[in-house]
């Protein structure tokens, strides 16, 4: 969490941003909140990006003002106009690109004063893994697949029964480039699995960590997946 203040004490307002990550090809949110004002027409929101000459987005006098918007953001940004009055200056970003990564500044002017806060925005690709029993294999084998990751992640297998065991000798992981030539499909195979055990396939890069669990018993197979973004710090 980053909390910024205006330059001169009495005329400063608190602006708060949260570091976040964008999944390329999808929509992203750059979070920013501020002390609200009672009049929408008195609020100015400016989003800027370090190293970019034009504005990312500007909202003032109750409407978007995009005449100074940088080329790389054209047609790709929007504020939540109905929530500005309650102090939400968050920015929606369409079709996140790798090049959108960087340091952003959320700069606010209201009748109470000015304030700003920076936000670190990481971009990459991350997706939920799915673990299945590979019935085509000669021995009991598990297959963990996740369709989109970037940068290349690490894959680690773990087991509830054999806690702390190193499965690198009995697993094989491959990375297959997807058609857009950036993200990759992750496939990891674990051999010699035993029943009545829960196995976890953990995929991690510097942006996200995802886990796919599978519990294999005589009578049933249970699956569970979850994904967590790393380094979501408020500022």
């Amino acid at each position: 969490l980053i909390i910024g203040f205006g330059i001169s004490g009495r005329h400063s307002i608190t602006v708060t941003t949260v570091a976040s990550a964008g999944n390329i090809g999808e929509d992203g949110i750059l979070s920013c909140t501020f002390e609200p004002d009672i009049k929408l027409s008195d609020i100015v929101i400016q989003w800027l990006k370090e190293g970019v000459i034009g504005l990312v987005h500007e909202f003032k006098e109750g409407k978007d003002e995009l005449s100074e918007q940088d080329e790389m953001f054209r047609g790709r940004t929007a504020v939540f106009a109905d929530q500005v009055i309650v102090g939400n200056a968050s920015l929606r970003l369409k079709n996140v690109q790798l090049t959108d990564a960087g340091t952003y500044k959320c700069y606010i002017i209201t009748s109470k004063g000015k304030g700003n806060a920076n936000l670190e925005y990481k971009t990459g690709a991350f997706s939920m893994p799915e673990v299945n029993v590979d019935y085509n294999a000669s021995s009991e084998t598990l297959r963990c697949e996740a369709p989109r990751w970037f940068p290349q992640p690490t894959v680690v297998w773990a087991s509830q029964v054999d806690q702390g065991a190193n499965f690198s000798e009995v697993s094989n992981t491959s990375f297959e480039l997807n058609s857009e030539n950036v993200t990759m499909k992750v496939v990891s195979v674990l051999y010699n699995v035993t029943i009545n055990n829960t196995y976890s396939c953990m995929i991690e890069n510097d942006i996200a960590k995802a886990t796919g669990d599978i519990k294999v018993t005589e009578s049933e197979i249970k699956r569970r997946s979850h994904l967590q973004l790393l380094n979501s710090k408020a500022s």
Partner: antibody, heavy 119, light 107 residues
Framework: QVQLVESGGGVVQPGRSLRLSCAVS????????VQWVRQAPGKGLEWLAV???????DYNAAFLSRLTISKDNSKNTVYFQMNSLRAEDTAVYYC?????????????WGQGTLVTVSS | DIQMTQSPSSLSASVGDRVTITCKAS??????VSWYQQKPGKAPKLLIY???NRYTGVPSRFSGSGSGTDFTLTISSLQPEDFATYYC?????????FGQGTKLEIK
């Protein structure tokens, strides 16, 4: 309320140029992009180009060499020029405004102006 | 270019019927799909934007759903004024593209 009005249509000879205008009211050209879409008689919709609030443009690659869009914010008008017209450019030409700045759909359309390319 | 394939291309139905039109994108377009209604000699009218958001003033019998590559426009109970041609369009990447249209006729 938001309004877009196209003008400049009519009969144009093959090989000649066409200049259309789209006069807007009820919103500012510094807040929203304006799209151009055409529809040949009895056919579907075809997106041609957009001019953004900043004045930058994006074109359908199929028309890149023949199209130019510009605007005059003070006159609330967008201009559309297409060169080297051929018979297959005969269509109703529409200008339209996005529903949001992030372009999720075209909310407001002009009435359209018919361009007939014929000798 | 992203192809938007609409089906069916034409459809006969009666007042009160529930009608579904589908649109399939040749690659993922997120939720950047909109639906339009067009009557002869008139400009298209926006019904749904962002795949599922009903535009201001559009009757609640119109609804949209889908994300990724598969999208649906549903008219829950056809009214006489709904007989028209419907188009889907994507605004995810350039060039923006439209489906070929679905002509909805009275049975």
């Amino acid at each position: 309320q938001v309004q877009l009005v196209e003008s400049g249509g009519g009969v144009v000879q093959p090989g000649r140029s066409l200049r259309l205008s789209c006069a807007v009211s009820g919103f500012s050209l510094t807040s929203y992009g304006v799209q151009w879409v055409r529809q040949a008689p009895g056919k579907g919709l075809e997106w041609l180009a957009v001019i953004w609030s900043s004045g930058s443009t994006d074109y359908n690659a199929a028309f890149l060499s023949r199209l130019t869009i510009s605007k005059d914010n003070s006159k609330n008008t967008v201009y559309f020029q297409m060169n080297s017209l051929r018979a297959e450019d005969t269509a109703v030409y529409y200008c339209a405004r996005d529903v949001t700045t992030i372009v999720e759909g075209f909310a407001h359309w002009g009435q359209g102006t018919l361009v007939t390319v014929s000798s | 270019d992203i192809q938007m394939t609409q089906s069916p291309s034409s459809l006969s139905a009666s007042v009160g019927d529930r009608v579904t039109i589908t649109c399939k994108a040749s690659e993922k377009v997120g939720t950047y799909v909109s639906w339009y209604q067009q009557k002869p000699g008139k400009a298209p009218k926006l019904l749904i934007y962002g795949a599922s958001n009903r535009y201001t003033g559009v009757p609640s019998r119109f609804s949209g759903s889908g994300s990724g590559t598969d999208f649906t426009l549903t008219i829950s109970s056809l009214q006489p004024e709904d007989f028209a041609t419907y188009y889907c369009g994507q605004t995810y990447s350039y060039p923006f593209t439209f489906g070929q249209g679905t002509k909805l006729e009275i049975k």
